[in-house]
Interface confidence: medium
């Protein structure tokens, strides 16, 4: 469809509330340091302008693209260069280069303090102005996560408001709010990581990589739907995510709503698990579809070998319609294996493709590809064994101990990576234990590998900004589906020159005593990384002793009447002790 005014079209489709929310998210994701009030002003101006275009689509500037309108708004900010430096250089470019330039300046690791929920203050804000409260939530999440899936953030904002509607009435606001906010926070962080991986796959590996990922995922989830149906959804979904990752949030949200409508209208041929999703309002409906339970497998599935090994026309199919044939293979294999991770399914499809590429050029192709399915077993065994070993380690050490084991493992593999990044990534990798190891056997593999893909993508995104390790660059860029096996296969870096011992790194203060448990752990784990960077060959026994002594030292000083005085006296002794143990 062609519209005289794109902004009027989107305003009418989305309605004022969602339109304003999405515009706020868009500006917050680009200008991550601007105060909320500045963004509200921009949103108000854009909304007023959109309304004039709705009233008269041929009014001045209404025919401009949304990129042009948004870009012009950003570039009109007087303090742009002062606060954002070279982002202002983007304003010298023309569209579409200007928008590309803005996207490249999004910061995945902005220097914004962690949000600490204060139930009393938050309830006061909520009761004073619900609309502002909703907007502030969108702003705070969007600026910290510049690739957050915008329509999904609107959904989480509704859930957030609902939590406050319920808990601000409660006698004990904190007891009601804090666990609910924490639960929502975990969901939001997972959602951010999932979307960041989708955007990375589109931006770094192309649309075809994202389509292959989606095809496998949707085939697992909707095994009753046939290939044509899945392919249509994959194509539409790729468009939605391409738009959101590209900053076209209004178009993305509009197209996502259309896709949800299509899925619900055709649920009879897609999945039996969508009924209750389709009765919900728009944002809940889209979220529910995305999270839908796997449908049961059709009873009458034929053995895969018939079509992909025994059929004499395999090479004809492969040569004459390569992408569709491989797509069909991935669809058929995925729907039969809900227990496999998406990455594993894509690795299997890659091996199948490589085998046909090789065999179809030979004298006797059927004899050559006859055993292709046997090649898949090692691909399946590798992650299964790895998960088994790591889950055993997790059971033995507990979450904190398991995180420390991963800190040691990864610091030895890639010691060049910054300490905060190593701590963040290893801590998140360590969470795979509590997330997946308790799951039933048939869910463990997909749970673990798909989660690890999210965490390793975070490492890749952070490393790309300041590359320091060729090994990390290689694992991140060579193959999306082989990232996890690539990192797993890395061995300790024997070429690394140890860091000098800096006493300041191991100087602690009284604030350590009042920190929440997770922040205390981060301090200790930061010290552990620095220790390993100084002594990469430290033994497990040495590290265990140092960590034990550190815990005793902190406990002693936090129990002392004057914390700071204790740290000042005991700290230097602790440093001497460390050096002695590691000598």
């Amino acid at each position: 469809d062609t519209y005289k005014s794109e902004i009027a079209h989107r305003f009418k489709d989305l309605g004022e509330q969602y339109f304003k929310g999405l515009v706020l998210i868009a500006f917050s994701q680009h200008l991550q340091q601007c105060p909320y009030e500045e963004h509200v002003k921009l949103v108000r101006e854009v909304t007023e302008f959109a309304k004039t275009c709705v009233a008269d689509e041929s009014a001045e500037n209404c025919d401009k693209s949304i990129h042009t309108l948004f870009g012009d708004k950003l570039c009109a900010i007087p303090s742009l260069r002062e606060h954002y430096g070279d982002l202002a250089d983007c304003c010298e470019k023309e569209e579409p280069e200007r928008n590309e330039c803005f996207l490249q300046h999004k910061n995945d690791n902005p220097d914004i303090p962690k949000l600490k929920p204060d139930p009393v203050a938050l309830c006061a804000d909520f009761q004073e102005d619900e609309q502002k409260f909703w907007g502030k939530y969108l702003y705070e999440i969007a600026r910290r996560h510049p690739y957050f899936y915008a329509p999904e953030l609107l959904y989480y904002a509704i859930i957030y408001k609902d939590v406050f509607s319920e808990c601000c009435q409660a006698a004990d606001k904190a007891a009601c709010l804090l666990p609910k906010i924490e639960h929502l926070r975990e969901k939001v962080l997972t959602s951010a990581a999932k979307q960041r991986l989708k955007c990375a796959s589109i931006q770094k590996f192309g649309e075809r990589a994202f389509k292959a990922w989606s095809l496998a995922r949707l085939s697992q989830r909707f095994p009753k739907a046939d290939f044509t149906e899945i392919s249509k959804i994959v194509t539409d979904l790729a468009k939605v995510h391409k738009e959101c990752c590209h900053g076209d949030l209004l178009e993305c949200a509009d197209d996502r709503a259309d896709l949800a409508k299509y899925i619900c209208e055709n649920q009879d041929t897609i999945s039996t698990k969508l009924k209750e999703c389709c009765d919900k309002p728009l944002l809940e409906k889209s979220h529910c579809i995305a999270e839908a339970k796997r449908d049961e497998l059709p009873a009458d599935l034929n053995p895969l070998e018939h079509d992909f090994v025994e059929d004499k026309e395999v090479c004809k199919n492969y040569k004459e319609a390569k992408h569709v044939f491989l797509g069909t293979f991935l669809y058929e294999y995925s729907r039969r294996h809900p227990d496999y991770s998406v990455s594993l399914l894509l690795r299997i499809a890659k091996i199948y493709e490589a085998t046909l590429e090789d065999c179809c050029a030979k004298e006797d192709p059927p004899a050559c590809y006859a055993t292709v399915f046997d090649k898949f077993q090692p691909l399946v065994d590798e992650p299964k064994n790895l998960i088994k070993q790591n889950c055993e380690l997790f059971e033995k050490l507990g979450e904190y101990g398991f995180q420390n084991a991963l800190i040691v493992r990864y610091t030895k593999k890639v010691p060049q990576v910054s300490t905060p990044t190593l701590v963040e990534v290893a801590r998140k990798l360590g969470l795979v234990g509590s997330r997946c190891c308790k799951r039933p056997e048939e869910e463990r593999l997909s749970c673990a590998e798909d989660y690890l893909s999210l965490v390793l993508n975070r490492l890749c995104v952070l490393h790309e900004k300041t590359p320091v390790s060729e090994k990390v660059t290689k694992c991140c860029t060579e193959s999306l589906v082989n990232r996890r096996p690539c990192f797993s296969a890395l061995t300790p870096d024997e070429t690394y020159k140890p860091k000098e011992f800096v006493e300041g790194t191991f100087t602690f203060h009284a604030d350590l005593c009042t920190l929440p448990e997770d922040e205390k752990q981060i301090k200790k784990q930061t010290a552990l990384v620095e220790l390993l960077k100084h002594k990469p060959h430290a033994t497990e026994e040495q590290l265990r002793t140092v960590l034990g002594n550190f815990a005793a030292f902190v406990q002693k000083c936090c129990a002392a009447p004057d914390h700071e005085a204790c740290f000042a006296v005991e700290g230097p002794k602790f440093v001497i002790e460390i050096r002695g143990i590691l000598a």
Partner: nanobody, 126 residues
Framework: EVQLLESGGGLVQPGGSLRLSCAAS????????VAWFRQAPGKEREFVAG????????YYADSVKGRFTISRDNSKNTLYLQMNSLRPEDTAVYYC???????????????????WGQGTLVTVSS
């Protein structure tokens, strides 16, 4: 559900031609792999020709290559089999079959097709 209805069979002299049609309903014909099979009296059902779904890849049994042509008209949702240079050994009931699960893949194995027409008789005799 896919319903298939064949037509166009009849009596023809050796060397003559016939065009069979198969009208489909309940599914777009270009979204599903479709094929023609035949069964002569006292014999097994055998693959004659097939066409992939979503991609126009055609497949033929060796015995009909160069004589028969499979095609489809998406606007009419109909599959065709143009049969030229007919021989007495082509005498059989001709069935149209559809396999919507995976478009593209046209198998020569009859058991892999869940949907069948009722068949149309072709007799080649002088």
């Amino acid at each position: 559900e896919v319903q298939l209805l064949e037509s166009g069979g009849g009596l023809v002299q050796p060397g003559g031609s016939l065009r069979l049609s198969c009208a489909a309903s309940g599914r777009y014909i270009d979204e599903t792999a479709v094929a023609w099979f035949r069964q002569a009296p006292g014999k097994e059902r055998e693959f004659v020709a097939g066409i992939g779904g979503g991609v126009d890849i055609t497949y033929y049994a060796d015995s009909v290559k160069g004589r028969f042509t499979i095609s489809r008209d998406n606007s009419k949702n109909t599959l065709y089999l143009q049969m030229n240079s007919l021989r007495p050994e082509d005498t059989a009931v001709y069935y149209c079959a559809a396999r919507p699960g995976s478009p593209l893949i046209t198998s020569k194995v009859a058991d892999l097709y869940p949907y069948w027409g009722q068949g149309t008789l072709v007799t080649v005799s002088s």
